[in-house]
Interface confidence: low
Amino acid sequence: AGVFELQIHSFGPGPGPGAPRSPCSARLPCRLFFRVCLKPGLSEEAAESPCALGAALSARGPVYTEQPGAPAPDLPLPDGLLQVPFRDAWPGTFSFIIETWREELGDQIGGPAWSLLARVAGRRRLAAGGPWARDIQRAGAWELRFSYRARCEPPAVGTACTRLCRPRSAPSRCGPGLRPCAPLEDECEAPLVCRAGCSPEHGFCEQPGECRCLEGWTGPLCTVPVSTSSCLSPRGPSSATTGCLVPGPGPCDGNPCANGGSCSETPRSFECTCPRGFYGLRCEVSGVTCADGPCFNGGLCVGGADPDSAYICHCPPGFQGSNCEKRVDRCSLQPCRNGGLCLDLGHALRCRCRAGFAGPRCEHDLDDCAGRACANGGTCVEGGGAHRCSCALGFGGRDCRERADPCAARPCAHGGRCYAHFSGLVCACAPGYMGARCEFPVHPDGASALPAAPPGLRPGDPQRYL
């Protein structure tokens, strides 16, 4: 166990032309804070991947007030170190991401606003217990100067913080086979007790009580050789003909990774990929607590009072992500029904409804005919969010207020002439045709395709369309 410590020395414009303008001034007061993310190994993972070794946030720096006429100076920094505790062995090689954030001050809607000013990343080899290492990283026109170290927490010592020390039992010497604990010469290396029965030749341990196997050996005590001949499957049955041996339980069996971490086997052990906010060999430690203020955009932090428990950010409307760092396009969920227009006002959603609909989400279909009168005996018909009138004969228009011309549609077929009539229209048919719309031909022999014409009307006479 131990602590990674990061000391920020300065953050400001880098050398050369194109120096950035200050992000803070009398006009835009703001303050800085930093975030560090550590990952084991020399990985080139994306910035969003879990900080498996841990993460930390600095305190907020002092409010920045610029001196008129002075060149853009290094910006004022938060006090103190950024400390990332690690529960297990220090890996020796690690990747880091250091982010510089600006907190805008002033009247904000929904709390302060944050923006990322610069992000630097690197991969380093570092032995625990060594001196401070100095570094300079540039991000665009910005320059970050910092120092870092890894130190073990007693009783752990060594370059990986895996050796344990205890006070000497006698002033002159340590126990058999044990060395003095440099640089604590007055203490002795404590024996590291592996799991009982762990093979001294093929097994080893980095923590008391465990038994981890060297390559080529397996089993709970590392006493079973792994066959090099082909087996049916990596964990296939033992076969006398192939000479395969059944390997012991796989290192990921039973998933040793806590808090939703995913396990992957390595040649000598397993590796946990931890979800955001957790780290450690088995993802058992939460590196960020509510005291670090990890929730952005006014998110409410719950839990995480001590480093061994997780925190959860409850995000305000319009934000999401484990740290409320992402703005939600809430309109993409299409909350407005019936073709309503969605407006994301930041503090609330609004739906602008189409005609005929109402309600917070345009969910109410208004009675289209309520309060709508159709004139001249027309009847109202609902549909599609808009009313329409079915007009009585001789009337038209949206509200049946217009007198219709019954002949406008040329209803008389075969050259018949149309006459408007108070109760409709009358067709005067051309010779050879008959019917209300002159639609029927008169047979040459004088008979018609229709029953005999009503009394008093000859086939050529005008027919009233009722």
Epitope: E66, Q108, I109
Partner: antibody, heavy 119, light 107 residues
């Protein structure tokens, strides 16, 4: 190409509220000051106030009691309201975009709206 | 509020002349000053920002200099399209304030 298009009522009576809106087309809405500036006929320019995409506002103290600037990031629009107008508020009103810490870099402007206050 | 005093308020010049307009701040404003050109019926146009940086697309005959309290806009060779009114603007502190303007007229 960034464009700022503004609109609003051009003729007001004394004591009414001036209301103008500026829409931003073709550019990011975050990382800028969205500003209102006015110019009385034949006179110089006067800064009214500004808002950031996150809703932080700054107003000219001479107008602060009457002015309100709001932002609608979903529509890339920001608006100006000036209450209790008098003839002294007659001016061409401009919206403009300014960068954070940019050294007076108002690089894009709206076309201007003449607002006349008359009884 | 920071007062911006611009001088002269007007000047007459001929095409090809070298013209200088000055702006003085009532207190130090670093280099947070810009120069704008305005023609009748048009919105102002940014020429110079951060006291001396030439805005993209602006002819190189325009230049700015100065810092803290005293600033100068220089037009090295006046062209016909340069006859307009010029304003300085400080955005060091609130409220932002403009100079009173300098009208450049044809002699």
């Amino acid at each position: 190409q960034v464009q700022l298009q503004q609109w609003g009522a051009g003729l007001l009576k004394p004591s009414e509220t001036l209301s103008l809106t500026c829409a931003v087309y073709g550019g990011s809405f975050s990382g800028y000051y969205w500003t209102w500036i006015r110019q009385p006929p034949g006179k110089g320019l006067e800064w009214i106030g500004e808002i950031t995409h996150s809703g932080s506002t700054n107003y000219n103290p001479s107008l602060k009691s009457r002015v309100s600037i709001s932002v609608d990031t979903s529509k890339n629009q920001f608006s100006l309201k000036l209450s209790s107008v008098t003839a002294a508020d007659t001016a061409v009103y401009y919206c403009a975009r300014g960068e954070y810490g940019s050294g007076s870099r108002f690089d894009y402007w709206g076309q201007g709206t003449l607002v006349t206050v008359s009884s | 509020a920071i007062q911006m005093t611009q001088s002269p308020s007007s000047l007459s010049a001929s095409v090809g002349d070298r013209v200088a307009i000055t702006c003085r701040a009532s207190q130090g404003i670093r280099d947070d000053l810009g120069w704008y050109q305005q023609k009748p019926g048009k919105a102002p146009k940014l020429l110079i920002y951060a006291a001396s940086s030439l805005q993209s697309g602006v002819p190189s005959r325009f230049s700015g200099s100065g810092s803290d309290t005293d600033f100068t806009l220089t037009i090295s060779s006046l062209q016909p399209e340069d006859f307009a009114t010029y304003y300085c603007l400080q955005d060091y502190d609130y409220p932002l304030t403009f100079g009173g303007g300098t009208k450049v007229e044809i002699k």
